[in-house]
């Protein structure tokens, strides 16, 4: 897998999507995980509802919330008041039983608000973690880099 | 194995600049940010700022910003940090350090440092 | 900024000892917390993440504990190897600060 980047500004919502194959994963659950250390387990934070047909119906834990569009085969994570200690690796998961297929590897990098002048350029970001070669970057809208593409210009 | 090599000592004058270069290797450059943390002679550890090696973006700390720019350049796997107008209390060990993949982690590999010494 | 404090700033030991460091933040982290070793001339090495994962390679003599805003560092038993400074940091607000170190001696 790949890894897909989305950015967000501290204390903004962040929306993830993960595609899938709808028929292939149909009848299956699915989790958002949160990957610990650079070769951690990922640790679940948060899943669908349990009876699959009501997938649809957004799942909170704390700040971070779950919603799956079974027909259309897009899970949609929202990261609420994105905050510094939120960048790091992710993964959408499909279950079944007590496996767990990934579908996604997702890295998040938290920007400082650039209207926020008391705390500008004031963040810490704590690095991202495994190889993405062909990754790209999803702000609101998202693309992939063309081969030997710049993604974008540095900014400060 | 994973490495950063910094660049060598600078003694450098109050006011001027000075450009301090991190090479990495063994791993892949653009899947991991770098940090920059300097530590006074005597003192504590402070850190600078970080830049993402995969698209440019950078968060400084306040402290330092509109004196301090983080660079990379991805062809040749090398993380640079430009601080200006120097005075004496910039007199540091500059060190870089590899993102470590999560927030819930800090730095695992760190360059071996250099020293910039700010003296008239 | 969330202030560190780290306590005690030296401690002298001996080898076989168990040395234990604090570490109090100024408002609570939940347990964004790491723990480092440096030794002169040295970059700082990552011993404990997440306050209490042991960081892969480090001896199993150190462990870290706590949430919220006090944590500890632990030793077991003290190694000639060990005898370095020791900060702590957390990872949890804007800007990531670090405690002001504690300098473990040969007593």
């Known amino acids: 897998h790949n890894t897909t980047v989305f950015q967000g500004v501290a204390g903004q919502s962040l929306q993830v999507s993960c595609p899938y194959d709808s028929m292939k994963h149909w009848g299956r659950r699915k989790a958002w995980c949160r990957q610990l250390g650079e070769k951690g387990p990922c640790q679940r934070v948060v899943s669908t509802h349990n009876l699959w047909l009501l997938s649809f119906l957004r799942r909170w834990n704390g700040s971070t919330a779950i919603t799956d569009d079974t027909l259309g085969g897009t899970l949609t994570i929202t990261l609420r008041n994105l905050q510094p200690h939120d960048a790091g690796l992710y993964q959408c998961q499909s279950l079944h039983g007590s496996e767990a297929d990934t579908l996604r590897k997702v890295l998040v990098e938290v920007l400082a608000d650039p209207l926020d002048h008391r705390d500008a350029g004031d963040l810490w970001f704590p690095g991202e973690s495994e190889s993405f070669e062909d990754a790209h970057v999803e702000h609101s809208i998202s693309r992939s880099l063309l081969e030997g593409e710049i993604p974008f210009p540095p900014t400060s | 194995q994973v490495q950063l090599v910094q660049s060598g000592a600078e003694v450098k004058k109050p006011g001027a600049s000075v450009k301090v270069s991190c090479k990495a290797s063994?791993?892949?450059?653009?899947?991991?940010?770098i940090s920059w943390v300097r530590q006074a002679p005597g003192q504590g550890l402070e850190w600078m700022g970080w830049?993402?090696?995969?698209?440019?973006?950078?968060n400084y700390a306040q402290k330092l910003q509109g004196r301090v720019t983080m660079t990379t350049d991805t062809s040749t796997s090398t993380a640079y940090m430009e601080l200006r107008s120097l005075r004496s209390d910039d007199t540091a060990v500059y060190y870089c350090?590899?993102?470590?993949?999560?927030?819930?982690?800090?730095?695992?590999?760190w360059g071996q440092g250099t020293l910039v010494t700010v003296s008239s | 900024d969330i202030q560190m404090t780290q306590s005690p700033s030296s401690v002298s030991a001996s080898v076989g000892d168990r040395v234990t460091i604090t570490c109090r933040a100024s408002?609570?982290?939940?347990?964004?917390l790491a723990w480092y070793q440096q030794k002169p001339g040295k970059a700082p090495k990552l011993l404990i993440y997440?306050?209490?994962s042991l960081q892969s390679g480090v001896p199993s003599r150190f462990s870290g504990s706590g949430s919220g805003t006090d944590f500890t560092l632990t030793i077991s038993s003290l190694q000639p190897e060990d005898f370095a400074t020791y900060y702590c940091?957390?990872?949890?607000?804007?800007?990531?600060?670090f405690g002001g170190g504690t300098k473990v001696e040969i007593k």
């Open positions: 350090a590899r993102g470590s993949g999560s927030g819930y982690d800090s730095w695992y590999d």
């Open positions: 063994g791993y892949t450059f653009t899947s991991y940010g």
């Open positions: 830049i993402s090696t995969y698209n440019g973006n950078t």
């Open positions: 408002q609570g982290i939940d347990s964004w």
């Open positions: 997440a306050a209490s």
């Open positions: 940091q957390q990872a949890y607000s804007l800007p990531p600060t």
